[in-house]
């Protein structure tokens, strides 16, 4: 988790002076409570934006946005700590709204937005604000929470974004596999504009079941520029075992920018279709 | 122009099934979540299923939960929902909607964040 850039962060608006800090997500409020402490924040919305860093970098970003309620305790609002809490690692990353003026009640409703907080393709994250300060202990809560989780690198938006590019999503290697005679699948692929070599992972199943009866590696070497977007064709010899019959194949490119961490593209053949009723039983059995 | 139309309510007997759909017109349907909503007569509105942009995360409403199927079709740009063993509690105004981000709300109250929603299809559970 990181946020977008270091430029200015800005959280000022008409009426009121605000400035962005680094927060070590402990406001001081949790260890001195207040008496008076604002309300929750109201219409909490969290949104997939994408933005481009001063170099030119494409990223996907937690669009946050909020507003207040309008009740009096917004005379004790004195700022905000925007959460946001990546869920398979634990990692959580804060930055806190400090109000440098009172808010006043004014014709329009109070809005806030925040942009800078880059997010990682097919992760989930939690996002709260809270308000500040914090309740005291057993006060009412002052934060909303939401839950979103991001497209993977599959989804046209986030194909051409930086992280999702760096990892080979625009490679498209149109897999086909083609069962042969004598126990051989024949697999074709096509080759990215790289001189990196490639790995075909097969991996067999029986028909109904998940557990591999088969499992074999296929080195590629990496092609010559010639062969850049030509379809490299490979032919796979099976086990001979009768019902391991469902194949994956899997390719594993290692290109420069992502190493042994590249996006995997795979197709699976299914086991033929099985007859729907059995072979009749001859009424006589021949002798010969 | 961007719309949802939901078709395949009706009335039907407690314990038996109905599978509503929803076509999708006007936008990108394979880029984003989409989610089906219903609303109880005199109630407000319910979150009941959402599913995300490939079908690789789907959500569930702890009532519907073990009952009720949510899918999608980017082909043809449909939502699905199989309702089994129909309750008279389910008896509502059933609604798909489409999520404004391209992310997949999976927590908290995400209805807030829905921008297009269907007329809706009356589901009616009685014996």
């Known amino acids: 988790l990181r946020l977008l850039d270091h430029r200015a962060l800005v959280c000022s608006q008409p009426g009121l002076n605000c400035t962005v800090k680094n927060s070590t997500c402990l406001d001081d409020s949790w260890i001195h409570p207040r008496n008076l402490t604002p309300s929750s924040p109201k219409d909490l919305q969290i949104q997939l934006h994408f933005a481009h860093t001063q170099q030119g970098d494409l990223f996907p970003v937690a669009h946050i946005e909020w507003t207040l309620q309008t009740d009096a305790s917004i005379l004790y609002l004195e700022g905000a700590e925007l959460s946001v809490l990546q869920l398979n690692t634990n990692e959580r990353l804060c930055v806190r709204f400090e109000f440098l003026s009172k808010l006043r009640h004014h014709h329009r409703r109070w809005r806030f937005t925040f942009s800078h907080f880059v997010v990682d393709p097919d992760q989930e994250y939690e996002v709260t604000v809270h308000h500040l300060p914090k309740p005291i202990p057993d006060g009412d809560p002052n934060h909303q929470s939401k839950n979103f989780l991001v497209p993977d690198c599959e989804h046209a938006r986030m194909k051409v974004t930086t992280p999702c590019m760096s990892s080979g999503s625009l490679w498209d290697p149109n897999i086909t596999v083609e069962t042969l005679e004598a126990h051989q699948l024949r697999v074709s692929f096509t080759l990215w504009n790289e001189s990196t070599h490639y790995q075909i992972l097969l991996t067999s199943f029986p028909h109904m079941e998940n557990h591999s009866c088969f499992e074999h590696m296929h080195h590629i070497p990496a092609p010559r520029p010639e062969e850049f977007h030509q379809r490299s064709n490979v032919t796979l010899t099976l086990r001979n075992l009768k019902g391991c019959c469902r194949h994956q194949v899997q390719i594993q490119p290692f290109f420069s920018s992502c190493l042994n961490d590249c996006l995997r593209h795979s197709a699976t053949v299914s086991c033929p279709e099985m007859p729907d009723t059995p072979e009749p039983i001859p009424d006589y059995m021949p002798l010969w | 122009q961007v719309q949802l139309v939901e078709s395949g309510g009706g009335l039907v007997q407690p314990g038996r099934s109905l599978r509503l759909s929803c076509a999708a017109s006007g936008f990108s349907f394979d880029e984003y979540a989409m989610h089906w909503v219903r609303q109880a007569p005199g109630k407000g509105l319910e979150w009941v299923s959402g599913i995300s942009w490939n079908s690789g995360r789907k959500g569930y409403a702890d009532s519907v939960k073990g009952r009720f199927t949510i899918s999608r079709d980017n082909a043809k740009n449909s939502l699905y929902l199989q309702m089994n063993s129909l309750r008279a509690e389910d008896t509502a105004l059933y609604y798909c909607?489409?999520?404004?981000?391209?992310?997949?709300?999976?927590?908290?109250?995400?209805?807030?964040?829905?921008?297009?929603w269907g007329q809706g299809t009356m589901v009616t559970v009685s014996s």
């Open positions: 909607a489409k999520e404004k981000s391209l992310g997949y709300c999976s927590g908290g109250s995400c209805s807030d964040g829905f921008d297009i």
